[in-house]
Amino acid sequence: SSPTSSASSFSSSAPFLASAVSAQPPLPDQCPALCECSEAARTVKCVNRNLTEVPTDLPAYVRNLFLTGNQLAVLPAGAFARRPPLAELAALNLSGSRLDEVRAGAFEHLPSLRQLDLSHNPLADLSPFAFSGSNASVSAPSPLVELILNHIVPPEDERQNRSFEGMVVAALLAGRALQGLRRLELASNHFLYLPRDVLAQLPSLRHLDLSNNSLVSLTYVSFRNLTHLESLHLEDNALKVLHNGTLAELQGLPHIRVFLDNNPWVCDCHMADMVTWLKETEVVQGKDRLTCAYPEKMRNRVLLELNSADLDCDPILPPSLQTS
């Protein structure tokens, strides 16, 4: 008989069995070649095995599927569609599997999929319908509540002739399928900006991680509708100042904790409102660590220790007085 998972530990399929069973329909609790399975834990791990495609013979009991550290390259439509369907699959981790293309409907027929991790894949081509599965203006709601997309930016020479931010946002917003999403991680993606409509259409977000990007400004981003937001990670970006509108929106969110460490804050006259806010707000975590990066004379000064006299702007000289 084919190897099955034991009740208490992971079992591995011997690679030589793969060809022997590939011609027949998979047995219900079979473990795919190059994978480890635990029926007790409802878990299948196919990790660091250089797989080039998703195993077809995944056991129907699988609830947690790890396909990390492989060489999948492309995730086609219905990559996880099986008969009978993988009705229990709730957590799918595909990180670090050299995916560069995720096609429309790649995650269709996974009715229980709540957590998806595509981190550390150079996604040059993420279909707008990767998560919604259809190009209808309003799709069936996705069951996803957690979507991890950290470091999915491809090298510059592999990017399509379009905005990477735009490609990702199109996938997040297509068909309004992700209205139930609670956690979204987009760290380390070289984002220069956040398209203004993205947050308004993800009203259920509890946790948003935008750390280690290149965001310069939040002026056109609205957080007002994110009334459930509990954590907002903006560490390690290129933020220079937060303006009054943003400060008011953040201050009004009932559950929020904001993380702002390691941004190149510009401590000139435009920073006065933010400093005033920081001195009184309780929503910024570790606010005593925030320091100025510019101008040079202010470098490393702690924002909380500044007063209005410190925050000046050089006067703009009339043209007749400017030197070349």
């Epitope: 009054n244 201050q251 009932p254 559950h255 929020i256 009184e280 707000t281 309780e282 929503v283 005593d288």
Partner: antibody, heavy 122, light 111 residues
């Protein structure tokens, strides 16, 4: 389900000390500011103080009426909030409530314990 | 410290009728566009329960007959149709500044 359970109240003589505990469950304790509020018999509510969360270094703020006498602390490994009360006075007699601040602490307390009675009398 | 003054001190009510309680602050409790003013109900023998936060947001699980309004220094809690279970003492609280302070309370009782 968020739960807060106070303990440690009782009868104590003026000038003595007492430590109240509040055991929390049902949420990530380190993420939240925690506070103590008291209510003298037949009177209104009085804020005693709070202790900040991990992100803000577990620093504390106290009301003027208890400053220098009462200390708020927390054991995050056990999810327990403490109120160390020294140099107790008869006017400290009250039901002491432990309360959790909302994620944005500016919106104050969203969950309260059932309270523990402290009676300071000779 | 910010002083909160509640009125009336006592409010006899008839079930099914509306009721209104006022809370006035000695200085503004607004900060960056939000008024940090809460309303709590303490039923007899129980701990306080949050009804309204941020002046007008109804806490999850609180019946929609409760509503809060106001900004700056003047605030109102309204009960559209009082029910027997609404009796108790109502407190307003400001969390704009440390120390946080409470109003003296309004006792709502059935006529």
């Amino acid at each position: 389900e968020v739960q807060l359970v106070e303990s440690g109240g009782g009868l104590v003589q003026p000038g003595r000390s007492l430590r109240l505990s509040c055991t929390a469950s049902g949420f990530t304790f380190t993420d939240y500011y925690m506070s103590w509020v008291r209510q003298a018999p037949g009177k209104g509510l009085e804020w005693v103080g709070f202790i900040r969360n991990k992100g803000n270094g577990y620093t504390t703020e106290n009301s003027a009426s208890v400053k220098g006498r009462f200390t708020i602390s927390r054991d995050n490994s056990k999810s327990i909030l403490y109120l160390q009360m020294n140099s107790l006075k008869t006017e400290d007699t009250a039901v002491y409530y432990c309360a959790r601040y909302r994620g944005n602490p500016h919106y104050a307390m969203d969950y309260w314990g059932q309270g523990t009675l402290v009676t300071v009398s000779s | 410290d910010i002083v909160l003054t509640q009125s009336p001190l006592s409010l006899p009510v008839t079930p099914g009728e509306p009721a209104s309680i006022s809370c006035r602050a000695s200085e503004s409790v607004e900060f960056y566009g939000t008024s940090f003013l809460q309303w709590y109900l303490q039923k007899p023998g129980q701990s306080p329960q949050l009804l309204i936060y941020g002046a007008s947001n109804v806490e999850s699980g609180v019946p929609d007959r409760f509503s809060g309004s106001g900004s700056g220094t003047d605030f109102t809690l309204k009960i559209s149709r009082v029910e027997a279970e609404d009796i108790g003492v109502y407190f307003c609280q400001q969390s704009r500044k440390v120390p946080s302070t409470f109003g003296g309370g309004t006792k709502v009782e059935i006529k």
